[in-house]
């Protein structure tokens, strides 16, 4: 209906304004409406000026219209020529009363379709539907997915890629991990993984300033080491690097009057040289204090070496051994005086023998036939030397002995001229200067070792070796090497070490083979005034220990992989050391520190006599140890 | 939406390389497995290998040897060379998207490619 | 690697009649993610490839709902309700379960009768 309702309007436009020419009149009869009219007929105008000369009245007149003015007239009433739409957004337009409709494809808006509809800002089609990415475009949209993720079929949705299962070599040696939209290349602790080569390779972390002190980097990690032996252990963090605290203070005053005869492992503490007139006669006096068995207090000769004398303790007794033109002589006597009690000694040259006292009490005369030293030239040369004697003499002694003493001396009184100038040598060397109170044992001051030979190989035995220790320690610091096997290419195949205990005011005791620990004894309270009792054995199938609060034989896992180490070492040689480790790597032990404290040792039943050692710090006392530190009210 | 486009020689030698390339338009590169699929006259589809974007690649056992596919992220195109081509390789070579769901949603309109002296 | 049997070879049809195209594969599809990755394409004369059905049985946008697959394992069927001049052409089958390695049907010719 409309249609013809727009051909018969076309007919009458036709007939009434171009066949003829028309007033507005004329056209309002052909429109029906003032809208239309109203916007047809200034146009229409303008065509008659376009294709006709001469102004128009609105009366009717006949004339030939061109076929230009009939195209002109029949455009004037379709509103959608030209288009007024959006070509990229409309689908169709529509002519209307002096108006046009645009109808829009989907996704375009307006009244001429140009406004894009945003899809994925629709509130009811959330993200346009897309699960990730929702792309607006012209007109429509698209999903898309984020970089690792792909499309699936129904356009909207996403998947991740498992890149792991897609190449598995991706990471090459290193082990390839799938997270969402990535995946990761994963190396164990201690490795990074490198792009290039596609493998793990390890962290440096020493070049990273990750200790304090030292660093020592190995496969996949890195150990911190502290330098034991200038004091330091290492940290609860495993990092950084702190003093290793005394847990039992010791009591290390000592006094200038009182001469400390183990000064040197090797050599002479003091040497004096008299000359007096030719009717002076050989006499010394002096206190003593010891707990050692053996050992040199002086040694007096004359100034040609002819003639000597020896005064030594054996077996905790004077001995005298004598020599000189007329006689040769050794005797020992009297009470055992290694007691730790400071004993008043006398030995004076009398005309026909020598004498010794203990407390004023003879218990030695030893005849002589003439005198000890020969005067020259009207005067009496003689030699002393306290705690030791020259080298040469040792060929020459009637009996061997161990010169090395570890003992005081006071109120000394030398040839009669009692002690003036000695003391003066004595008081500035501090090294020289003996405890005031001791007790019984061996002292290792946190500051050196004593090295023993020791044969372990047991021929008797199925096993080949053996190693049976105990130790009777008290402790001063928490940490600490007291016994070290150590191989001739500078490995520890055994330790036994003090560390302290994470739990307060404890020490654990650790066995080691080489930087291994193979057992912890955890929690003990060592420092205490108390000795403790430590035993342990081990041979190359067993570990076995005792401790004050409980026996055991050890048997683990990695164990028999560890004692197949210390059986190669003890089948080379090895060298013990007490107190500490000579200088090796600070990687070779878990613990490198000195020991500070007492501590007594014997191995497979032979009590270890540190005068016995093959080389010992001089600061490690042999015989003596320092009492415990008593508070004072006063302190 | 996205579209493929192959485009290269259409003749070549026997015992040459042949190459192609195809551009993805209208989509982003990293969204689908893009392969390469080819064709014989009067004959069934062969699947010769795919890429991933980030270069992770497969390909038909039979022609791995001659086989190398690579991808050019800034261009959003990838490539196909065949070494040694004989007349066997003569063919309508296909690049396809294959979806998440392991389907070929999107195929280029094919490329006829004849091996010949 | 997996081998795709189509059958028959041609099948000449009817207009307005059903078709049913068979697919064996040589072993189980079934991914072990538990989707069975079995596609149809549609290729009609003179034109590449089109998907028609992804994952056994679902449509692709834009595919007619005459076209419906079914199956399970190994043994799958593409179906066409009532067939039209237009859905002449090779139809194929395709296993991407084994993914990155894809296998083809041989293909089944549809024409009419």
């Known amino acids: 209906a409309n249609s013809l309702l727009e051909e018969t309007k076309q007919g009458n436009l036709e007939r009434e304004c171009i066949e003829e020419l028309c007033n507005k009149e004329e056209a309002r009869e052909v429109f029906e409406n003032d809208p239309e009219t109203d916007y047809f007929y200034p146009k229409y105008l303008v065509c008659l000026r376009s294709f006709q000369t001469g102004l128009f009245t609105a009366a009717r007149q006949s004339t030939n219209a061109y076929p230009d003015l009939r195209s002109c007239v029949n455009a004037i009433p379709d509103q959608c020529s030209p288009l007024p739409c959006n070509e990229d957004g409309y689908m169709s337009c529509k002519d209307g009363k002096a108006s046009f409709t645009c109808t829009c494809k989907p996704g375009w808006q307006g009244e001429k379709c140009e406004f894009d509809i945003n899809e994925c800002k629709d509130p009811s089609n959330i993200n346009g539907g897309c699960s990730q990415i929702c792309d607006n475009t012209p007109g429509s949209y698209h999903c898309s997915c984020k970089n690792g993720f792909v499309m699936l079929s129904n356009k909207k949705d996403c998947k991740d890629v498992d890149e792991c299962s897609l190449k598995p070599s991706i990471c090459g040696t290193a082990v390839c991990k799938n997270i969402p939209g990535d995946f990761e290349c994963e190396c164990p602790e201690g490795y990074r993984y490198n792009l290039k080569s596609k493998s793990c390779e390890d962290i440096d972390e020493c070049s990273e300033n990750m200790c304090a002190q030292l660093c020592v980097n190995y496969p996949g990690g890195y150990t911190c080491y502290c330098d034991g032996k200038k004091g330091f252990k290492l940290a609860q963090d495993q990092k950084s690097c702190e003093v290793v605290s005394v847990c039992l203070p010791l009591n290390l005053d000592t006094k200038y009057e009182l001469l400390y005869l183990a000064e040197q492992f090797a050599g002479v503490v003091l040497y004096l040289k008299f000359r007096l007139p030719e009717i002076s006669r050989f006499s010394a006096e002096f206190d003593f204090r010891t707990y050692d068995s053996e050992g040199v207090i002086l040694y007096a000769e004359s100034i040609d070496h002819s003639a000597w004398l020896l005064i030594a303790l054996r077996g905790g007794k004077i001995e005298v051994q004598l020599k000189n033109e007329h006689t040769s002589k050794i005797t020992t006597g009297g009470d055992v005086i290694n007691n730790g009690l400071w004993n008043m000694v006398s030995v004076e040259e009398l005309e026909h023998s020598i004498s010794i006292k203990i407390a004023k009490e003879a218990v030695m005369d030893i005849n002589k036939p003439g005198p000890l030293f020969k005067p020259e030239n009207g005067l009496l040369e003689t030699k002393v030397y306290f705690a030791g004697f020259p080298r040469k003499v040792e060929s020459e002694l009637i009996k061997p002995i161990n010169p090395r003493l570890d003992g005081c001396i006071r109120s000394w009184n030398l040839m009669k001229q009692g002690a003036s100038g000695i003391k003066e040598i004595i008081q500035e060397k501090q090294n020289k200067h003996c405890l005031v109170t001791v007790e019984k044992g061996s002292y290792y001051p946190g500051s050196g070792i004593a090295q023993f030979h020791i044969d372990y190989n047991n021929v008797s035995s199925a096993e080949g070796w053996h190693v049976n220790v105990t130790l009777n320690i008290r402790p001063s610091t928490g940490t600490g090497v007291m016994l070290a096997l150590v191989s001739g290419n500078n490995t520890v195949p055994f330790a036994v070490s003090l560390v302290d205990s994470t739990s307060e005011k404890s020490q654990d005791i650790l066995l080691s083979v080489e930087n291994t620990v193979i057992y912890r004894i955890q929690a003990l309270s060592l420092c205490s005034d108390q000795q403790s009792h430590l035993e342990f054995r081990v041979n190359r199938n067993n570990l076995e220990l005792s401790t004050p609060l409980k026996i055991e034989t050890i048997s683990h896992e990695d164990l028999q992989r560890q004692l197949a180490v210390l059986d190669k070492a003890m089948k080379a040689k090895v060298a013990t050391y007490l107190g500490g480790l000579p200088d090796v790597p600070f990687s070779a032990t878990p613990v490198n520190a000195f020991y500070n404290g007492c501590m007594e040792v014997n191995i497979n039943g032979v009590q270890l006599d540190l005068d016995e050692a093959i080389s010992k710090h001089n600061d490690i006392r042999a015989h003596s140890c320092p009492s415990v530190w008593k508070k004072t009210k006063n302190s | 939406q996205v579209q493929l486009q192959e485009s290269g020689p259409g003749l070549v030698k026997p015992s040459e390389t042949l190459s192609l390339t195809c551009t993805v338009s209208g989509g982003s590169i990293s969204n689908y497995y893009w392969n390469w699929i080819r064709q014989p006259p009067g004959k069934g589809l062969e699947w010769i290998g795919y890429?991933?974007?980030?270069?992770?690649?497969d390909y038909n056992p039979s022609l791995k040897s001659r086989v190398t596919i690579s991808v050019d992220t800034s261009k959003n195109q990838f490539s196909l060379k065949v070494t040694s081509v004989t007349a066997a390789d003569t063919a309508v070579y296909y690049c396809?998207?294959?979806?998440?769901?392991?389907?070929?949603?999107?195929w280029g309109q094919g490329t006829l490619v004849t091996v010949s002296s | 690697d997996i081998v795709m049997t189509q059958t028959p070879l041609s099948s000449p049809v009817t207009l307005g009649q059903p078709a049913s195209i068979s697919c064996r594969s040589s072993q189980s599809l079934v991914h072990s993610d538990g989707n069975t990755y079995l596609s149809w394409l549609q290729q009609r004369p003179g034109q590449p490839p089109r998907l028609l059905i992804y994952k056994i049985s679902n449509r692709f946008s834009g595919v007619p709902d005459r076209f419906s697959g079914s199956g399970a394992g190994t043994d799958f069927t593409l179906k066409i309700s009532r067939v039209e001049a237009e859905d002449v052409g090779v139809y194929y089958c395709?296993?991407?379960?084994?993914?990155?390695?894809?296998?083809f049907g041989g293909g089944t010719k549809v024409e009419i009768k």
């Open positions: 395709m296993q991407a379960t084994q993914f990155p390695h894809l296998t």
């Open positions: 396809a998207a294959l979806s998440g769901d392991h389907a070929f949603d999107i």
């Open positions: 890429i991933y974007y980030i270069g992770i690649t």
